[in-house]
Amino acid sequence: ISYDSPDYTDESCTFKISLRNFRSILSWELKNHSIVPTHYTLLYTIMSKPEDLKVVKNCANTTRSFCDLTDEWRSTHEAYVTVLEGFSGNTTLFSCSHNFWLAIDMSFEPPEFEIVGFTNHINVMVKFPSIVEEELQFDLSLVIEEQSEGIVKKHKPEIKGNMSGNFTYIIDKLIPNTNYCVSVYLEHSDEQAVIKSPLKCTLLPPGQESESAESAK
């Protein structure tokens, strides 16, 4: 199959592909809000092979407006064509298509994380899935941003091997009795726009000196 993909905005739906917890999630929105499908079927083909469309089994007759394609789309070197069909009963209300190059079009959602504040350091625990497919690593770097009193510091921890399992990073040399906020995100080598996590903040407990000063009062 060959293809031609200028930037048209008059398609009946818009698609977005995201790496969410290292799962490839395709989501869609209808531009015409007067169309109200009861269910959708998602199909795809690979541009490099003139094959017939394949129905995504777990996204056939689905009522959701997203689909997990992790087990279908394995290659970051392939271009994929998605076809979405929307139904009301047995009637096809619409069908629309989009071309995807995972390495270009994928947006990377931030991983889940927790923080625990100590007197002069913060433990940042980042949660990755226990197993992550090699092809879904995307040459990603984990970035941890530390913010305090208007100053932002970037930490790029070196992760040995795959981003899998839980990972703990210590932000040290911090000032006691100070409020710190932390955000994490995944950075791609191609300098795509990053999606930063919401900030998580903690007020570090006071150090020993201020503790003894407090008790002396």
């Epitope: 293809y3 031609d4 993909s5 200028p6 930037d7 048209y8 905005t9 008059d10 398609e11 009946s12 015409n32 169309i35 199909l43 017939d52 469309l53 064509v81 076809v83 069909e85 096809t92 209300l93 619409f94 069908s95 629309c96 298509s97 989009h98 071309n99």
Partner: nanobody, 122 residues
Framework: QVQLQESGGGLVQPGGSLTLSCAAS????????MSWVRQAPGKGLEWVSA????????YYADSVKGRFTISRDNAKSTLYLQLNSLKTEDTAMYYC???????????????QAQGTQVTVSS
């Protein structure tokens, strides 16, 4: 009821050109991918080309790539297929279909599908 009326076929010499048209009615044309399939004498239906609802994306089978061009006019609810550099193996009945046709292709043909005959012969 979905109605698709193909036209523009004919007899043409190898290397020649034709433009097929498909007038659509009975559904909201602009909301649908459209495609062309063909059936050569004594053969099964074969997928040829598809175009996205807005016309921004076009797709072609390897056998016609670089020779055929699919397009659409949503204001006129009409689908087109420009056939250039025709070969004898392009001889077939050509049908347009609503949505992206896939096996069994016959499921995608309009109820009273007529098609338009293209014959490439010297």
């Amino acid at each position: 009821q979905v109605q698709l009326q193909e036209s523009g076929g004919g007899l043409v010499q190898p290397g020649g050109s034709l433009t097929l048209s498909c007038a659509a009615s009975g559904f909201t044309f602009r909301n649908h991918i459209m495609s062309w399939v063909r059936q050569a004498p004594g053969k099964g239906l074969e997928w040829v080309s598809a175009i996205s609802s807005g016309g921004g994306n076009t797709y072609y089978a390897d056998s016609v790539k670089g020779r055929f061009t699919i397009s659409r006019d949503n204001a006129k609810s009409t689908l087109y297929l420009q056939l250039n550099s025709l070969k004898t193996e392009d001889t077939a009945m050509y049908y347009c279909t609503k949505d992206w046709a896939r096996p069994p292709y016959s499921d995608f043909l309009a109820p009273q599908a007529q098609g338009t005959q293209v014959t490439v012969s010297s």
